[in-house]
């Protein structure tokens, strides 16, 4: 038993890192493999994550961390049985994927404007929630060519856009995922979509 | 929100022992360590040790060892720190701290006097 | 005696910018990571700055901390009254048992 492609690691930078990797041939990864890991810190203890399949020879591991910050450093050994299959560090802030926003909503009362709101997926004392920046992607249901991506920039999480922006009487969804430039973090999975029907008034020809 | 609440002040005789506490809320107790330091009238801060309240394991400054022993009990979310053999160079506020790399919060402390 | 060294007192008037050095060695700030802690009369530190540079959420951007080699500097802008008390580096000693180190501790009085 081999690995054909050696562990690679994101973390959440708040309590999880997923690791994946391949082995060199079909394997039951719950049965077979274990994954410790263990923070470079005095008194640290090593943790045992048990990794799941992710395809035929594809193996994914969760591993729980707590109060995760950009000093921290973890020891990595795969084990099959009593053999050692590889041994690696990882550090988690330099490899961040952050948690996607959730509760995204469009606010369709405002007059001709739509509000789209969202959540920050970070609590106010972890590093991130004050230094996310977010995509909002925007697309039409009957027309795949109107499809459109906007950067907020700032860190309030909301968008607003003018209806008129969008075409009335049909149907849009949107989604939101967020990345953090201080770390360097990759973009976020997207928030799960939400629909709605674009109506405003057309201004009156004069 | 976080808060570290410590015992109060205490008079010791030189030789016998004191035993200050730090009990933590507003956040998991066994997720963060728990640091011991100290500070003598008008001097600077002395590091004395860490607790991981997870599994109760210790690590003390070389200048404590002997003399120190930090324990937890997860059921009240209360960390202790326990300084026996007192001498009056022991008189000092006596810090818990939360943190790992570095301290995010501090109790109030607590002023041990020894004095004969 | 600590092996973080810092200037025992700076002055400054208000209004004006402060910069507290902590100089250490190549065990310490030169292999680790920094953060400042603010003392204010009869209170417990508070941490100011951490990993090097960066602030708790509710930590004013008047104050800033930079670290270069073995040596680290916590500036303050804008300097004002309330911010007159006692500060104190901190770092990790690498060279036998990791262990927390803290600076000497600096008095700045605002004039």
């Known amino acids: 038993m081999k690995v054909l492609q050696e562990p690679t690691c994101v973390s959440d930078y708040m309590s999880i890192s997923t690791c994946e990797w391949k082995m060199n041939g079909p394997t039951n990864c719950s049965t077979e493999l274990r994954l410790l890991y263990q923070l470079v810190f005095l008194l640290s203890e090593a943790h045992t994550c048990i990794p799941e399949n992710n395809g035929g020879a594809g193996c994914v591991c969760h591993l729980l961390m707590d109060d995760v910050v950009s000093a921290d450093n973890y020891t990595l050994d795969l084990w099959a049985g009593q053999q050692l299959l590889w041994k690696g560090s990882f550090k988690p802030s330099e490899h961040v994927k952050p948690r996607a926003p959730g509760n995204l909503t469009v606010h369709t009362n405002v007059s001709d404007t739509l509000l789209l709101t969202w959540s920050n997926p970070y609590p106010p004392d972890n590093y991130l929630y004050n230094h996310l920046t977010y995509a909002v992607n925007i697309w039409s249901e009957n027309d795949p060519a109107d499809f459109r991506i906007y950067n907020v920039t700032y860190l309030e999480p909301s968008l607003r856009i003018a209806a008129s922006t969008l075409k009335s009487g049909i149907s849009y969804r949107a989604r939101v995922r967020a990345w953090a430039q201080c770390y360097n973090t990759t973009w976020s999975e997207w928030s799960p979509s939400t629909k709605w029907h674009n109506s405003y008034r057309e201004p009156f020809e004069q | 929100q976080v808060q570290l609440v410590q015992s109060g002040a205490e008079v010791k005789k030189p030789g016998a022992s004191v035993k200050v506490s730090c009990k933590a809320s507003g956040y998991a107790f066994t997720s963060y360590y728990m640091h011991w330091a100290r500070q003598a009238p008008g001097q600077g801060l002395e590091w004395m040790g860490i607790?991981?309240?997870?599994?109760?394991?210790?690590s003390y400054a070389q200048k404590f060892q002997g003399r120190v022993t930090m324990t937890r009990d997860t059921s009240t979310s209360t960390v202790y720190m326990e300084l026996s053999s007192l001498r009056s160079e022991d008189t000092a506020v006596y810090y818990c701290?939360?943190?790992?790399?570095?301290?995010?919060?501090w109790g109030k402390g607590t002023l041990v006097t020894v004095s004969s | 005696q600590s092996v973080l060294t810092q200037p025992p007192s700076v002055s400054a008037a208000p209004g004006q910018k402060v910069t507290i050095s902590c100089s250490g060695g190549?065990?310490?700030?030169?292999?680790?990571?920094v953060s400042w802690y603010q003392q204010l009369p009869g209170t417990a530190p508070k941490l100011l700055i951490y990993?090097?540079?960066k602030r708790p959420s509710g930590i004013p951007d008047r104050f800033s901390g930079s670290k270069s080699g073995t040596s680290a500097t916590l500036a303050i802008t804008g300097l004002q009254t309330g911010d007159e008390a006692d500060y104190y580096c901190?770092?990790?000693?690498?060279?036998?048992?990791?262990?927390?180190?803290f600076g000497t501790g600096t008095k700045l009085t605002v004039l």
């Open positions: 990993d090097n540079n």
């Open positions: 607790i991981n309240p997870s599994g109760g394991s210790t």
């Open positions: 190549s065990s310490n700030i030169g292999n680790s990571y």
């Open positions: 701290a939360r943190g790992k790399w570095w301290l995010y919060d």
């Open positions: 901190g770092t990790w000693d690498t060279s036998t048992t990791l262990q927390p180190l």
